[in-house]
């Protein structure tokens, strides 16, 4: 028996269902009584789901897995994983035994989009050109860790005086907080882009500082 899986990782959004595809080619006259199918975590060998002795033995993994019972006889050994969590990420091995056996591993990559960034400015009043301000760009509930990029109003990348921190929340998703310290010009727009590297999703936030006096305050 030869087991086939997709070589590319399966990308699944948090809280959605994912299918880990696995197939084999049954011989003529094949019956499910001959089939031993085991899904397990590749690294720890923890049992996830199994079909043995002619019947579905059910989920051994938080009761969120299922096979496609009507398709097994056709060689479809795929596994359905419901309500995906970040902790589900990793490699899963599909092990098929009929007379002989074969196995193959499929990788599950979990992802969650980042929220539209919120921008805060400190100090946020009595600003003058030449003041040093702190701009914080915060985006929430994403996975995996984000990349953050800053630009000024002309689209020029701002790389100095940036501190980016990732804080995992209760669900293991990430909140990203990026702080830019910049000396104000007369007018200025500052943009942050939060990128999810797996989803190639970009979330944009910007702050425009206007209405300040256009001249620097007189020297004392």
């Amino acid at each position: 028996v030869e087991v086939q899986v997709s070589e590319d990782p399966v990308v699944a959004l948090v809280d959605t269902d994912a299918t880990l595809r696995c197939s084999f080619s049954p011989e003529p006259g094949f019956s499910l009584a001959q089939l031993n199918l085991i899904w397990q975590l590749t690294d720890t060998k923890q049992l996830v789901h199994s079909f043995t002795e002619g019947r579905d033995q059910g989920s051994a993994y938080s009761n969120r897995t299922a096979l496609f019972p009507d398709l097994l006889v056709q060689g479809n050994a795929s596994l359905r994983l419901q309500r995906v969590r970040v902790t589900d990420e990793g490699s899963y091995t599909c092990f098929v035994s009929i007379q002989d056996f074969d196995s193959a591993a499929v990788s599950l990559q979990v992802a969650a989009p980042y929220s539209k960034p919120s921008m805060t400015l400190e100090p946020n009043k009595d600003l003058r050109p030449g003041n040093m301000v702190t701009i914080t760009c915060s985006s929430y509930q994403g996975y995996p860790e984000a990349e953050v990029f800053w630009k000024d109003g002309q689209g020029v990348p701002l790389t100095g005086n940036v501190t980016t921190s990732q804080m995992a929340n209760e669900r293991g998703l990430f909140d990203v907080h990026s702080v830019l310290r910049v000396v104000l010009g007369a007018n200025g727009t500052y943009s942050c882009l939060v990128r999810n590297p797996v989803l190639q999703q970009d979330a944009h936030g910007s702050v425009t500082i206007t209405g300040q006096p256009l001249t620097f305050p007189p020297e004392a």
Partner: antibody
Framework: EVKLVESGGGLVQPGGSLKLSCAAS????????MSWVRQTPEKRLEWVAS???????YYPDSMKGRFTISRDNARNILYLQMSSLKSEDTAMYYC???????????WGQGTLVTVSA | DIVLTQSPASLAVSLGQRATISCRAS??????????MHWYQQKPGQPPKLLIY???NLESGVPARFSGSGSGTDFTLNIHPVEEEDAATYYC?????????FGGGTKLEIK
């Protein structure tokens, strides 16, 4: 040189309140997430709170509602307002500068809070 | 909450030998990118000091005799060769999800 100096600890009765301060120097205070971590008399370490900016804070469930973290970026000071204190809150309270993935890179010397009748 | 269990609670190691401290998490603190486990040293009367972050990265200024390894649920701090000044209590801490928690500590004595 990064320097964090806590103050405000002392003896307080159960149900009472206390406000701790942490004066920071030697780094750009406003750029960093700041945290409070405490150490019980049994030497157990517990994360208390973290703050990104004035409106972005994080707490463990056990501290929510009773403890409030805040900061004054103009004066480089971190605060921890504690209320409805219990004997279990007796600990050395440390101010810490958080690293980029929530480790605690720099610690102050701590201020001792004792909750007792 | 993720519970971190350190072992042993205490150990005595001869000068110049290897000290190995284990930290086991009640669930994985790793992703495909990082292991969110950190190690601290605390001497009597002093605050904790960061030694290792993200499982294996040596904090600036920390001697190279300290090293960290591990992923998933099992992590190790190694000190080799042990020096007299390494007598202290060592703590692990994770930052994989809220709340961030610490291990109970391992007290290292130098023989």
């Amino acid at each position: 040189e990064v320097k964090l100096v806590e103050s405000g600890g002392g003896l307080v009765q159960p149900g009472g309140s206390l406000k701790l301060s942490c004066a920071a120097s030697g780094f750009t205070f406003s750029s960093y997430i700041m945290s409070w971590v405490r150490q019980t008399p049994e030497k157990r370490l517990e994360w208390v709170a973290s703050i990104v900016s004035s409106n972005i804070t994080y707490y463990p469930d056990s501290m929510k509602g009773r403890f409030t973290i805040s900061r004054d970026n103009a004066r480089n000071i971190l605060y921890l307002q504690m209320s409805s204190l219990k004997s279990e809150d007796t600990a050395m309270y440390y101010c810490a500068r958080s690293g980029t993935r929530a480790w605690f890179a720099y610690w102050g010397q701590g201020t001792l809070v004792t909750v007792s009748a | 909450d993720i519970v971190l269990t350190q072992s042993p609670a205490s150990l005595a190691v001869s000068l110049g030998q290897r000290a190995t401290i284990s930290c086991r998490a009640s669930k994985s603190v790793s992703t495909s990118a990082y292991s969110y486990m950190h190690w601290y040293q605390q001497k009597p009367g002093q605050p904790p000091k960061l030694l290792i972050y993200l499982a294996s990265n040596l904090e600036s200024g920390v001697p190279a005799r300290f090293s960290g390894s591990g992923s998933g649920t099992d992590f190790t701090l190694n000190i080799h060769p042990v020096e007299e000044e390494d007598a202290a209590t060592y703590y692990c801490q994770h930052s994989r999800e809220l709340p961030y928690t610490f291990g109970g500590g391992t007290k290292l004595e130098i023989k």
